[in-house]
Amino acid sequence: RSLQDTEEKSRSFSASQADPLSDPDQMNEDKRHSQGTFTSDYSKYLDSRRAQDFVQWLMNTKRNRNNIAKRHDEFERHAEGTFTSDVSSYLEGQAAKEFIAWLVKGRGRRDFPEEVAIVEELGRRHADGSFSDEMNTILDNLAARDFINWLIQTKITDRK
């Protein structure tokens, strides 16, 4: 998957809302530093971004795979082995709205806690209306079948 020329959508995960958009004077800069915005805080920020960025990457992968003009290139990349084999299945399960309940109540919570957390977050964002309309469209059109098959066929140890 290329990371170039891909517009970011709904990915910002703000760790702090203290800074104004405009450039502050040095006094405000000192205040910000006293609050702590250095490497340890940045590391925490990156931790919070990691799972969300992966979902965003998956969404962009799905969007590009649905682009007919790019399908030939996609197949070539599959043949080259440079396209992660689990992306398609992961995305369909990750984003399948009708699958959330099963994940939360069934073995999903027990065996796949990280994935459940992400799916639950997607559900929350749907509930409060903060998730993109585009994702709604994708969710409505994705089936859970492939993801179920993938869960059954994939050993937990292979994914951890």
Partner: antibody
Framework: QVQLVESGGGVVQPGRSLRLSCAAS????????MHWVRQAPVKGLEWVAF????????YYVDSVKGRFTISRDNSKNTLFLQMNSLTAEDTAVYYC????????????WGQGTLVTVSS | DIVMTQSPDSLAVSLGERATINCKSS????????????LAWYQQKPRQPPKLLIY???NRESGVPDRFSGSGSGTDFTLTISSLQAEDVAVYYC????????FGQGTKLEIK
């Protein structure tokens, strides 16, 4: 075509200030985090500062804390780095870099602007 | 911070031959939730900025020739150029983006 063009570098005396700019084009500037990365002959590549897409989050390497300020003007597609109390250790080529979808990964870099701190 | 160490510091390879550059991180950059290694490789030619080649340890960036490949997991990684071309002469850097970004010291690749 993504383009990042830095300006504002030059020779400056220790203790003085300098303001770097980075003009961005070819992508939707307001939807990406941006970084400053510097390259000194002795220290190699070193990440300096990050600003989130809307400017709400800013982070700095410890060595520039309290001296450097990163900011952006999304209406003008421009990134800034205000550098105060400069020392010889700040001498480097300063690159502005666009963040990819993945945090802290740099998919485009500017050509860089040289900052020399010398008396 | 995570310390990145590359080897060798410099490398001379004949045209058409394989070039291998190693990178070691002081701690794991593997994110278990998605099984991705947060390791990137950049190429920097003289008087040019770095260019992204590989991300997630093995994913080639768009437009990068398929002679470039990345491998490894956890703390040990390798960049391989399967058949060296004249235009591949450059300094190559690894970078971890799991935590606060840090770079290796660089490996200078030359033609033998």
């Amino acid at each position: 075509q993504v383009q990042l063009v830095e300006s504002g570098g030059g020779v400056v005396q220790p203790g003085r200030s300098l303001r770097l700019s980075c003009a961005a084009s070819g992508f939707t500037f307001r939807t990406y985090g941006m970084h400053w990365v510097r390259q000194a002959p002795v220290k190699g590549l070193e990440w300096v500062a990050f600003i989130s897409k809307d400017g709400s989050d800013k982070y700095y390497v410890d060595s520039v804390k309290g001296r450097f300020t990163i900011s952006r003007d999304n209406s003008k597609n421009t990134l800034f780095l205000q550098m105060n109390s400069l020392t010889a250790e700040d001498t480097a080529v300063y690159y502005c870099a666009k963040e990819s979808i993945l945090a802290a990964l740099f998919d485009y870099w500017g050509q860089g602007t040289l900052v020399t701190v010398s008396s | 911070d995570i310390v990145m160490t590359q080897s060798p510091d410099s490398l001379a390879v004949s045209l058409g031959e394989r070039a291998t550059i190693n990178c070691k991180s002081s701690q794991s950059v593997l994110y278990s939730s998605n099984n991705k290694n947060y390791l990137a490789w950049y190429q920097q030619k003289p008087r040019q900025p770095p260019k992204l080649l590989i991300y997630w340890a093995s994913n080639r960036e768009s437009g990068v020739p398929d002679r470039f490949s990345g491998s490894g997991s956890g703390t040990d990684f390798t960049l391989t150029i399967s058949s060296l071309q004249a235009e591949d002469v450059a300094v190559y850097y690894c970078q971890q983006f799991y935590s606060v970004p840090t770079f290796g010291q660089g490996t200078k690749l030359e033609i033998k």
